[in-house]
């Protein structure tokens, strides 16, 4: 149904080996990054914190899908993870490696 | 070509009458809102200011399109416009009505 397909956060586990980042990220082997999936149809729900532009774009798309694309479901808040990584050959621990995991999705 | 279809800002003129907002926005009759269109394929260009999460998601999509959706081309910077509008029956001027026009697009 439309509601089930609406913009929301869904699981996405990243294996660093799979994307070739194990060459510099020593630990962890992977992490739950999540992703934002689903549609942003008008009217845009408040919890998706739409900008005025997103509301207008969604409204234009509703009236004429040729004129404007839909607003897009994207991360609006990201959180850090901790990593052990190689920095110029030095194994370094970083408690907060920013912008790695989605905590909130919204329509933009 | 792929480059021509890459994430960028494109024109989108909004006519307030068309979207029914002429009932409360007195002037202007419309404005250039722009929109963000195009794909966010890996590797994501620097000018599209991708987050680490967007880079990872694009990379996962490249390797397995079933596992993750593409990163999305969205407004990353919005600018205000000036409007004359009705506020409880009073015609009011707002110099900076925020978040109305796209000034930059990026991959998120």
């Amino acid at each position: 149904n439309a509601k089930g397909n609406y913009c929301k956060r869904t699981p996405l586990y990243i294996d660093f080996k799979e994307i070739g980042w194990d060459s510099w990220i020593i630990a962890p082997p992977g992490y739950e990054a999540y992703e934002c999936r689903g549609v942003c149809n008008y009217p845009l729900a408040e919890h998706l914190t739409p900008t005025k532009h997103a509301i207008i774009q969604a409204l234009v798309h509703l009236k004429n899908s040729q004129k404007a694309s839909k607003a897009c479901c994207v991360p609006t808040k990201l959180e850090p993870i901790s990593i052990l990584y190689l920095d110029k050959g030095v194994v370094t621990y970083k408690f907060k490696y920013e912008g790695m995991a989605v905590s909130e999705c919204g329509c933009r | 070509n792929a480059k021509g279809n890459y994430c960028k800002r494109t024109p989108l003129y909004i006519d307030f009458k068309e979207i029914g907002w002429d009932s409360w926005i007195i002037a202007p009759p419309g404005y250039e809102a722009y929109e963000c269109r195009g794909v966010c394929n890996y590797p994501l260009a620097e000018h599209l200011t991708p987050t680490k999460h967007a880079i990872i998601q694009a990379l996962v999509h490249l390797k397995n399109s079933q596992k993750a959706s593409k990163a999305c081309c969205v407004p990353t910077k919005l600018e205000p416009i000036s409007i004359l509008y009705l506020d409880k029956g009073v015609v009011t001027y707002k110099f900076k009505y925020e978040g109305m026009a796209v000034s930059e697009c990026g991959c998120r």
Epitope: I26, P28, P29, Y31, S82, G89, V90, V91, T92 | -
Partner: antibody, heavy 115, light 111 residues
């Protein structure tokens, strides 16, 4: 305030499985990492594994085949499960919070492996 | 895989300065940060030094960490040693194999 508390059996039979729970309070498991470290009587510290804040798990390869670490973020619990215990697995088992550094430890639980 | 080698025990007198050593068996000591932990008898460890030379809040500035490339060792120096400094001190480092490696510990006795 921040606390970590290990709970589990004091005594385990050889060849049996050890289950320890680390219950945390005062912080989120999605923000901080949790180490499992053990210390045999009169001996040094040995890192066993880490439950990372992003959900990834690392193990000391010395335990990899018989050790499993997991968590329940809603209950603020981290679990250690180790199979096929032998007498030399007798130790104090600690969980510890890793932020910018290891800033909080549980008080430890002494597990004796004996028949 | 490297190991971190610490002397089993050391004695010192109150008020003096003592330097505890942590030698890396293979590879460069500078290729990962060294952390130092203090453990009193029957207690959980506490971090004294992290990222090689940083002190957590509450750790006296009598404690300092350093690296000596010539001996491929990290050192924990304690100035003006106090009775309450009597404890076992463990160094710890990182590797790409066993991610978190502890030294065997040095028991410091204050006379």
């Amino acid at each position: 305030q921040v606390q970590l508390q290990e709970s589990g059996p004091d005594l385990v039979q050889p060849s049996q499985t050890l289950d320890i729970t680390c219950t945390v309070s005062g912080f989120s498991l999605t923000t901080y990492n949790v180490h499992w470290v053990r210390q045999p009587p009169g001996k040094g510290l040995e890192w066993m594994g880490t439950m990372w804040n992003g959900g990834g798990i690392d193990y000391n390869s010395a335990f990899k085949d018989r050790l499993a670490i997991s968590r329940d973020t809603s209950k603020n619990e981290v679990f250690l499960k180790m199979d096929s215990l032998q007498t030399d697995d007798t130790a104090v088992y600690f969980c510890a919070r890793l932020g910018y550094y290891v800033d909080y430890w549980g008080q430890g639980i002494l597990v004796t492996v004996s028949s | 895989q490297f190991v971190l080698i610490q002397s089993d025990s050391m004695s010192t007198s109150a008020g003096s300065t003592v330097k505890l050593s942590c030698k890396r068996s293979t590879g460069n000591i500078g290729s990962s940060y060294v952390y130092w932990y203090q453990q009193h008898e029957g207690r959980s460890p506490t971090t004294m030094i992290y990222d090689g030379d940083k002190r957590p809040d509450g750790v006296p500035d009598r404690f300092s960490g350093s690296i000596d490339s010539s001996s491929n060792s990290a050192s924990l120096t304690i100035n003006n040693v106090q009775i309450e400094d009597e404890a076992v001190y463990f160094c710890q480092s990182f590797s790409s194999g066993i991610k978190f490696i502890f030294g065997g510990g040095t028991k410091l006795t204050v006379l």
